[in-house]
Amino acid sequence: CKAMHVAQPAVVLASSRGIASFVCEYASPGKATEVRVTVLRQADSQVTEVCAATYMMGNELTFLDDSICTGTSSGNQVNLTIQGLRAMDTGLYICKVELMYPPPYYLGIGNGTQIYVIDPEPCPDSDF
């Protein structure tokens, strides 16, 4: 497989609403025009696919309707947002980028972003 460098932040803290955003940047060796981005979650040596999207350069990045991910693309970077996260979802989120067209096919896998999710404290009852 032709390898490609993929960069992503080491650590991200999810918001109190369970939303985490990070940028996945790839060093395209050629005129990449169709790209597939996959977010993988690694926890306890198990890797699962969180979401994936294929997009043409200049077109919007569209995940499936029921996906917990949304994103936008700009040049060689993808801004990814993962929603609905809870404390149990804390883990390493790896960005995998495939240059699908034109040939040749390239694959790049980032080192992962550790996303920390802290469940919000329930609001105390107020006596007002």
Epitope: N59, Y101, P102
Partner: antibody, heavy 120, light 112 residues
Framework: QVQLVQSGAEVVKPGASVKISCKAS????????INWVKQNPGQGLEWIGD????????NSNQKFEGRATLTVDTSISTAYMELSRLRSDDTAVYYC?????????????WGQGTLVTVSS | DIVMTQSPLSLPVTPGEPASISCRSS???????????LYWYLQKPGQSPQLLIY???NLASGVPDRFSGSGSGTDFTLKISRVEAEDVGVYYC?????????FGGGTKVEIK
Amino acid sequence: QVQLVQSGAEVVKPGASVKISCKASGYKFTDHFINWVKQNPGQGLEWIGDINPNNGGTNSNQKFEGRATLTVDTSISTAYMELSRLRSDDTAVYYCARLRREYFYAMDYWGQGTLVTVSS
Amino acid sequence: DIVMTQSPLSLPVTPGEPASISCRSSKSLLHSNGITYLYWYLQKPGQSPQLLIYQMSNLASGVPDRFSGSGSGTDFTLKISRVEAEDVGVYYCAQNLELPLTFGGGTKVEIK
């Protein structure tokens, strides 16, 4: 249904240019690459290049680089190929074809072809 | 450029009988991602080419199952289990492992 309709046959003089159109219908034009392919009389197929309708980005066969210009007009879902400095060996049928990602970027729909005859 | 070589150049066939076309590439089309970037197209007389097979062995939508594709990294075969009159035309193999995309010279299938 998906259709790619190309412009009609052209007779052009050596050294001149020709611009062929390919109007797409039946699908979202910006969702698929358009390829251009040359077929010499009674012979095989030769890839010229492709264009991404979203940003006009192209990839070309070096053999045609500098002479084949690929463009699109998304407002009318039409792709164009202009071939300049024409020579007699440019006499051929030219096809546009749509790429389909589900078929790993094979050409799943083709235009009917445009015959270009280069003759003085 | 990857060179695609087809044989035979011409193939006279009898309706109802099987037929086989060979294609060889100058470089392996089997990528380390497991995909074989080999395609078959058919150009019927007076028509534009049409896609038959993608990724070496997958039938495109609407293609009859009498067609099948097989092969290794460099040697490929298109088989028609029982030829029908409508199968006449020129068959092309093609690769899109790398640019430029290249086609074989074609095999003309005609009824005996």
